[in-house]
Amino acid sequence: GSERTCCPVNWVEHERSCYWFSRSGKAWADADNYCRLEDAHLVVVTSWEEQKFVQHHIGPVNTWMGLHDQNGPWKWVDGTDYETGFKNWRPEQPDDWYGHGLGGGEDCAHFTDDGRWNDDVCQRPYRWVCETELDKASQEPPLL
């Protein structure tokens, strides 16, 4: 089958997911497309433990995650519920700031230098993190 049972080369395994950390920048949509072409998605942070893991690997660098409000409400790219899920915004964020002079507000979320989240202009070329889940079935013991 096409189920993934181990992480690809250059990806990091953690808690049954695989993560890939970029070392260059792209706009949010281009980063999202890169991950999709790798059969993955921009990272979806579902716990404080996952937040600390990602933060440890990216360091103090602005880095895109799979969270945006380009169509109105905030949404995770994999469908994880935003309202009831984990959040780690900086104080006063998200603020949809229009004062940057680039047109429009701020619709894409990124990790800031201290790991907390901020919304920013989606066209900014930030680093990004891809995530793909390992085959759920492979965690179960084989049927005898």
Partner: antibody
């Protein structure tokens, strides 16, 4: 030796269909995204479509969206381009290539030898 | 879409010459730029990726540089087998787009 071999090109009338195949040898395509690029004397090289390793995600140039479909059969180490509603401007040499993920992007190498598609009445 | 332009469109050179080809993107593509060589009747061959990384098996007389919107391919000392057409390609954003090509022919 890593090789890609296209087939399925030929002469077709406007509005007709063709299915191109790209057979890989020397490597397993299930580990890679794969892509199609075409070349015409007038427009030069034009990226057409790309498909992820599992086949779950694909992307298309606007000029072919809704008419062309990329697909793959990893068990046969082959991928395809189904071309419908063909137009004269689709006349080109069609190349397949491996799309290797390195340094934060996808790079096309190697390429097949190409197959000629001619759309004419 | 990101437009790619190349200059010159053709260049006449002699064996041993240093040849420089430039590629310009209509917007910033960071270092997501490739260079290809194509000979008549053959498929393009990847020479350089990520603006300056030499593809395996490509001779070191080929080099690439640049970032953002302006890029350069240099052939330090032209050999007979280098007479061909050279294309740049951006892989920053879909649709990935190619330059129109630069033909290097014999003076």
């Amino acid at each position: 030796e890593v090789q890609l071999l296209e087939s399925g090109g030929g002469l077709v009338q406007p509005g007709g269909s063709l299915r191109l195949s790209c057979a890989a040898s020397g490597f397993t395509i299930s580990n890679y995204a794969m892509t199609w690029v075409r070349q015409t004397p007038g427009k030069g090289l034009e990226w057409v479509s790309v498909i992820s390793a599992s086949g779950g995600n694909s992307f298309y140039a606007d000029s072919v969206k809704g008419r062309f479909t990329i697909s793959r059969d990893n068990s046969e180490n082959t991928f395809y381009l189904q071309m419908n509603s063909l137009r004269a401007e689709d006349t080109a040499v069609y190349y397949c290539a491996k799309a290797r993920a390195v340094a934060g992007s996808h790079w096309f190498d190697p390429w097949g030898q190409g197959t000629l598609v001619t759309v004419s009445s | 879409d990101i437009q790619m332009t190349q200059s010159p469109s053709s260049v006449s050179a002699s064996v041993g010459d240093r040849v420089t080809i430039t590629c310009r993107a209509s917007q910033d593509v960071n270092n997501y730029l490739a260079w290809f060589q194509q000979k008549p009747g053959k498929a393009p061959k990847l020479l350089i990726y990520a603006a300056s990384s030499l593809q395996n098996g490509v001779p070191s007389r080929f080099s690439g540089s640049g970032s953002g919107t302006d890029f350069t391919l240099t052939i330090s000392s032209l050999l007979p087998e280098d007479f061909a057409t050279y294309y740049c390609q951006q892989t920053n954003s879909f649709p990935f787009t190619f330059g129109p090509g630069t033909k290097v022919d014999i003076k």
